[in-house]
């Protein structure tokens, strides 16, 4: 005996009460896949989260996170409040970052300035706290007749403070 | 049945004061960390402040600093926020929610009803 349930399509289910008819996904659920027996609840985009798109009988409401928010996990679970630049999130809220460190971005970790003499530059623009140091030429790339009348900040090392 | 009530809301003038209520029943607030979120007649919600279990407190909006003050009373399972000079534009509904931190929220967040705070002259 063939299943009719395979015959039922996404945005339906399959109603064994009614000797296994197709009916419409009530209001607030949907199916993404034909066949099935039950359709699923809706998503409620509520509290933090606002709603991306709506739900319809054939997908599920995407939600967003509000304003100073942002999402985190799959399908935006979570959402995780947005620090300023310049700062990282902690156990103990939003903390600037350490003199040496920075961050561009409204979420993430302060990361460490660029080490210029690694690569053997100079230091172009020094880094703050929102801004990564900036390398330039190596001194040697320098031409005593063609230096710059603005001579290339020192580099300042993580741990001391400005002056 | 876990739930949080918010309560103290009311109409007060322009420089008053008011002091909101977050009553937790069926769980621990002790446990959990309590945020205040408002939102205020067709805008999106916004976050308030926030005290974590062991009492830190984070202050989302920027506009509330020096105005807005958090506390809990474990012992009576409440969180209190009390809002001083208060301005027409903090006219909202205040909603408490028991985040485990207050740094990220999730789907599962107990979030109470709401109270309404209008400020008018």
């Known amino acids: 005996l063939q299943d009719l349930c395979s015959n039922c399509p996404a945005g339906t289910f399959c109603d064994n009460n009614r000797s296994q008819i197709c009916s419409p996904c009530p209001p607030n659920s949907f199916s993404s896949a034909g066949g099935q027996r039950t359709c699923d609840i809706c998503r409620q985009c509520k509290g933090v989260f606002k709603t991306r798109k709506e739900c319809s009988s054939t997908s599920n409401a995407e939600c967003d996170c509000i304003s100073g928010y942002h999402c985190l996990g799959a399908e935006c679970s979570m959402c995780e409040q947005d620090c300023k630049q310049g700062q990282e999130l902690t156990k103990k809220g939003c903390k600037d970052c350490c003199f040496g460190t920075f961050n561009d971005q409204k979420r993430g970790i302060c990361r460490p300035w660029t080490n210029c003499s690694l690569d053997g530059k100079s230091v172009l623009v020094n880094g703050t706290k929102e801004r990564d140091v900036v390398c330039g030429p190596s001194p040697a790339d320098l031409s005593p007749g063609a230096s710059s009348a603005t001579p290339p900040a020192p580099a300042r090392e993580p741990g001391h403070s400005p002056q | 049945q876990l739930q949080l009530v918010e309560s103290g809301g009311g109409l007060v003038q322009p420089g008053g004061s008011l002091r909101l209520s977050c009553a937790a029943s069926?769980?621990?607030?002790?446990?959990?960390?309590i945020g205040w979120f408002r939102q205020a007649p067709g805008k999106e919600r916004e976050g308030v402040l926030c005290i974590s279990s062991s009492g830190d407190v984070t202050i989302y909006a920027d506009s509330v600093k020096g105005r807005f003050t958090i506390s809990r009373d474990n012992a009576k399972n409440t969180v209190y926020l009390q809002m001083n000079s208060l301005k027409p534009e903090d006219t909202a509904v205040y909603y408490c929610?028991?985040?485990?931190?207050?740094?990220?929220?999730?789907?599962?967040?107990?979030w109470g009803q709401g109270t309404q705070v209008t400020v008018s002259s």
């Open positions: 929610v028991a985040p485990r931190i207050c740094s990220t929220y999730s789907s599962d967040d107990y």
């Open positions: 069926g769980f621990t607030l002790a446990d959990y960390a």
